[in-house]
Interface confidence: medium
């Protein structure tokens, strides 16, 4: 039986002045960015709500956030797309200053949910901003996390040509199969349109000199992606900060030497 | 010369009424994202609306300005307004106007001198 | 909406000297925050946006860092127009932008 009182969830509630921030984000990435000013964010806000509104948090489908992500269709060019695992800060740092890659953070649909939590109430129009359910405590199918299951799945389908991935070296896992990027991104990967996957593993410590591309779950990485027939390549980041200052300024002379 | 320049404020009695305007020159108005952005005498900066680019079709506030201030713009004039209702004492301060860069990023790089606004009775 | 908090307040510095301002946020902004300079009765002047980025026509002497909630402001070496008032802004999570309180560099 599905609850009438207002539920009583484990996470925190949908972030404040919601409805503003999306809308508000939806005007300013249209009209920056050229390709997408046909776009109306008011229809992008009732495809967003149509989503979750009067549902029952813990029953949210890929199948309701389908008219969002028809309106929010964008293609990103061959060559240009960058995944990221746990070490988001830096990959949009990354993106940045490097504006001819994309993160889904840097695509509409990831600009306008980036940070932000939602869920609604089975059977009112109300948005709950007490509380919504938690992945691991209430529930996975919750809002939040079946968007970013979905829009995470329609962009790594999109990819083509050489895709990038930042992974984070200081973890005990740098490929976790549990992260949105090793089940969802990797196994949406399309082999006809994606010739390699390359990871670039972000060293943590200053005097980490060790080569992390060895590391079991990166040889575990490997498999998967070789077994789709997409071949896989790895680089060590050993110097995050130069790494961005490089980018920035690629003809400094210490740019030439290992980063 | 890209340049904005306020004009409209003035002294004005509680609950009166003042409309500001800021002159565009240099660049094309209408590709721009505009604010207001004011500082009351010896405080710091506080934002106060904003306007999308072309027709103005979505306009933003600040919660203490709500439901009072209404930005516009007119870019046939190359100007943008701010009409402000039912002035309180705490709305005394410099407005200036500020454009945004049109970039993927949303910072203000160019501001106009500013124009005073006194709310005193 | 998201609170920056400047620091210091006032930092009192001689000509020559480096100057270091910080800006920390209630919350992650990635890197959309945007330092301005502003001397008595003049209008804000940007500096730096995109946290690290130089407006144009800004001398090189002044430099952004950071990303996330901590961000910095650095002058390398003082010049007597440098003093002045400095406010970071963040254009991350908006309606409203928000701008810290300020901090004033004076001449020690």
């Known amino acids: 039986v599905l609850p009438r009182w207002r539920q009583q969830w484990s996470g925190s509630g949908t972030t404040s002045r919601f409805p503003e921030t999306v809308l508000a984000r939806c005007v300013k990435y249209t009209e920056v960015h050229p390709e997408m000013r046909h776009v109306d964010c008011q229809s992008v806000w009732d495809a967003f709500k149509g989503a979750f509104i009067s549902k029952y948090p813990c029953n949210i489908t890929e199948e309701d956030y389908q008219p969002l992500v028809k309106l929010g269709t964008q293609t990103v060019p061959c060559n240009k797309t960058l995944l990221w695992s746990r070490i988001k800060d830096l990959a949009h740092q990354f993106t940045q200053v490097q504006r001819d890659m994309f993160t889904l953070e840097d695509m509409l649909l990831g600009y306008l949910a980036d940070d932000l939590t939602w869920c609604g109430e089975f059977n009112t129009f109300e948005i709950n901003y007490q509380s919504c359910p938690d992945w691991r405590k209430d529930c996975s199918n919750n809002p939040v996390s079946v968007f970013w299951k979905t829009v995470s799945r329609r962009f790594a389908e999109t990819a083509c040509g050489v895709v990038h991935v930042m992974l984070n070296g200081s973890r005990s896992k740098i490929f976790d199969k549990n992260s949105t990027f090793g089940s969802v991104e990797v196994h949406n990967l399309q082999p006809e349109k994606v010739q390699a996957l390359e990871a670039w593993v972000i060293h943590g410590g200053r005097e980490d000199s060790r080569d992390l591309c060895q590391d079991p779950t990166i040889k575990e990485l490997e498999s998967i992606i070789s077994k789709r027939n997409i071949r896989f390549f790895c680089k060590n980041i050993y110097r995050p900060d130069k790494f961005l200052q490089c980018v920035k300024n690629p003809e400094d002379s210490s740019c030439l030497s290992g980063i | 010369e890209v340049q904005l320049l306020e004009s409209g404020g003035g002294f004005v009695q509680p609950g009166g009424s003042l409309r500001l305007s800021c002159a565009a020159s240099g660049f094309t108005f209408t590709n721009y994202v505009m604010n207001w952005v004011r500082q009351a005498p010896g405080k710091g900066l506080e934002w106060v609306s904003s306007?999308?680019?072309?027709?103005?079709?979505?306009?933003w506030y600040a919660d203490s300005v709500k439901g009072r201030f209404t930005i516009s713009r007119d870019n046939s004039r190359n100007t943008l307004y701010l009409q402000m209702n039912s002035l309180r004492a705490e709305d005394t301060a410099i407005y200036y106007c500020?454009?945004?860069?049109?970039?993927?990023?949303?910072?203000?790089?160019?501001w106009g001198q500013g124009t005073t606004v006194t709310v005193s009775s | 909406e998201i609170v920056l908090t400047q620091s210091p307040g006032t930092l009192s510095l001689s000509p020559g000297e480096r100057a270091t301002l910080n800006c920390r946020a209630s919350q992650n902004v990635r890197s959309d925050l945007a330092w301005y300079q502003q001397k008595p009765g003049q209008a804000p002047r940007l500096l730096i946006y995109?946290?690290?980025n130089r407006a144009t026509g800004i001398p090189d002497r002044f430099s952004g860092s950071g990303s996330g909630t901590d961000f910095s402001l650095t002058i390398s070496r003082l010049e007597p127009e440098d003093f002045a008032v400095y406010y970071c802004?963040?254009?991350?999570?908006?309606?409203?932008?928000?701008f810290g309180g300020g901090t004033k560099v004076e001449i020690k």
């Open positions: 995109d946290a690290s």
């Open positions: 802004q963040q254009y991350y999570d908006w309606p409203p932008y928000t």
């Open positions: 306007i999308s680019i072309s027709g103005g079709r979505y306009t």
């Open positions: 500020a454009r945004e860069m049109n970039t993927y990023s949303f910072p203000m790089d160019v």
